[in-house]
Interface confidence: low
């Protein structure tokens, strides 16, 4: 009987198994009983990343600067263009179709992980002994000042948003 399934990198058409086109090439014509599958390379602005029987190559992604995007890796006939975001911006979604500004960590929170082109800033609450008094996309929680090392005493306790206030020791007569 004519085959109902074909080997890897083949496809079934007109009761025959034809070779798929390799990545970077599109299908021009199916094989016949005495000709092989005919494939053609994708043009410079196109790609196909799998063994395929596509009659059209896919357009490379456009990294639109108006959306804050720039090219991280230029596409080839076998790979799509990879976009990333301009400095200070990160991808809005996994497909990185547009960019948004990195978020800042509010006072009382510090930067746990600085944002990249593809991920936003990760903030963490400042634990006891640390504070952040600024809204920043770069600043980590800073430790409270150690009054003792300055031969001073704590005059005002620190919070997650403020440093301790040090002052001179009361000298008892």
């Amino acid at each position: 009987e004519p085959p109902t399934a074909c080997r890897e990198k083949q496809y079934l058409i007109n009761s025959q198994c034809c070779s798929l086109c390799q990545p970077g090439q599109k299908l021009v014509s199916d094989c016949t009983e005495f000709t092989e599958t005919e494939c053609l390379p994708c043009s410079e602005s196109e790609f196909l990343d799998t063994w395929n029987r596509e009659t059209r190559c896919h357009q490379h992604k456009y990294c639109d600067p108006n959306l804050g995007l720039r090219v991280q890796q230029k596409g080839t006939s076998e790979t799509d263009t990879i976009c990333t975001c301009e400095e200070g911006l990160h991808c809005m979604s996994e497909s990185c179709e547009s960019c948004v500004p990195h978020r800042s960590c509010l006072p009382g929170f510090g930067v746990k992980q600085i944002a990249t082109g593809v991920s936003d800033t990760i903030c963490e609450p400042c634990p006891v002994g640390f504070f952040s008094n600024v809204s920043s996309a770069f600043e980590k929680c800073r430790p409270w000042t150690s009054c003792e090392t300055k031969d001073l005493v704590v005059q005002q306790a620190g919070t997650n948003k403020t440093d301790v206030v040090c002052g001179p020791q009361d000298r008892q007569r």
């Epitope: 025959q16 070779s19 014509s29 199916d30 016949t32 009983e33 005495f34 000709t35 092989e36 005919e38």
Partner: antibody
């Protein structure tokens, strides 16, 4: 269903040109199939003459090459064979075929 | 040219019995992609050839499953598991891997 039908004169004089046409129905000639001419002298075996594709690309049997011309007319969905300088040995049933489907054949006799 | 040699040239068979036809090519019919373009045709008396098998072992649509093809490289076989009266005719192998395409001389199957 694909059907092929040969047509042309049944009698050709020696040294003249044999001309045959194959009309294809039930299938567009402009798809990726190669359209063949095959002949069979009376009481003998089959001989491949050549093929043509819809875009005019072709391949001919070297034993006949300098006498064979094939052409294709996509508007009429047909293809043709011309064999020049014929002699008695060219007397045969001529088939047009896509290999999976064949015409019924037409007998061409070369005789004065 | 690739020479296709069939044997036997004549094959008398009893109805209901199996039959086997061999076809040998003068060079390998496997192409660089691993495909082997070897066809088998049946020509009943007074009719056009009809394709039975393509690419060595693939039965063409409508062909009874008593017909099977096998082989590789240069050695190919057509088998009929149980011969029926309608199987009488001449069987041809045809290679379409190399140009020019070439047929075997034909094997005449007849009923004993």
């Amino acid at each position: 269903q694909v059907q092929l039908q040969e047509s042309g004169p049944g009698l050709v004089k020696p040294s003249d040109t044999l001309s045959l046409t194959c009309a294809v129905s039930g299938y567009s000639i402009t798809t990726n199939y190669y359209w063949n001419w095959i002949r069979q002298p009376p009481g003998k075996g089959l001989e491949w003459i050549g093929y043509i594709n819809y875009d005019g690309s072709n391949n001919y049997n070297p034993s006949l090459k300098n006498r064979v011309t094939m052409s294709v007319d996509t508007s009429k969905n047909q293809f043709s064979l011309k064999l020049s300088s014929v002699t008695a040995v060219d007397t045969a049933v001529y088939y047009c075929a896509r290999l999976d489907y064949w015409g019924q054949g037409t007998l061409v006799t070369v005789s004065s | 040219d690739v020479v296709m040699t069939q044997s036997p040239l004549s094959l008398p068979v009893t109805l209901g019995q199996p039959a086997s036809i061999s076809c040998r090519s003068s060079q390998s019919l496997e192409n660089s992609n691993g495909n082997t373009f070897l066809n088998w045709f049946q020509q009943r008396p007074g009719q056009s050839p009809r394709r039975l098998i393509y690419k060595v072992s693939n039965r063409f649509s409508g062909v009874p499953d008593r017909f099977s093809g096998s082989g590789s490289g240069t050695d190919f076989t057509l088998k009929i598991s149980r011969v029926e009266a309608e199987d009488v005719g001449v069987y041809y192998c045809l290679q379409v891997t190399h140009v020019p395409f070439t047929f075997g001389q034909g094997t005449k199957l007849e009923i004993k």
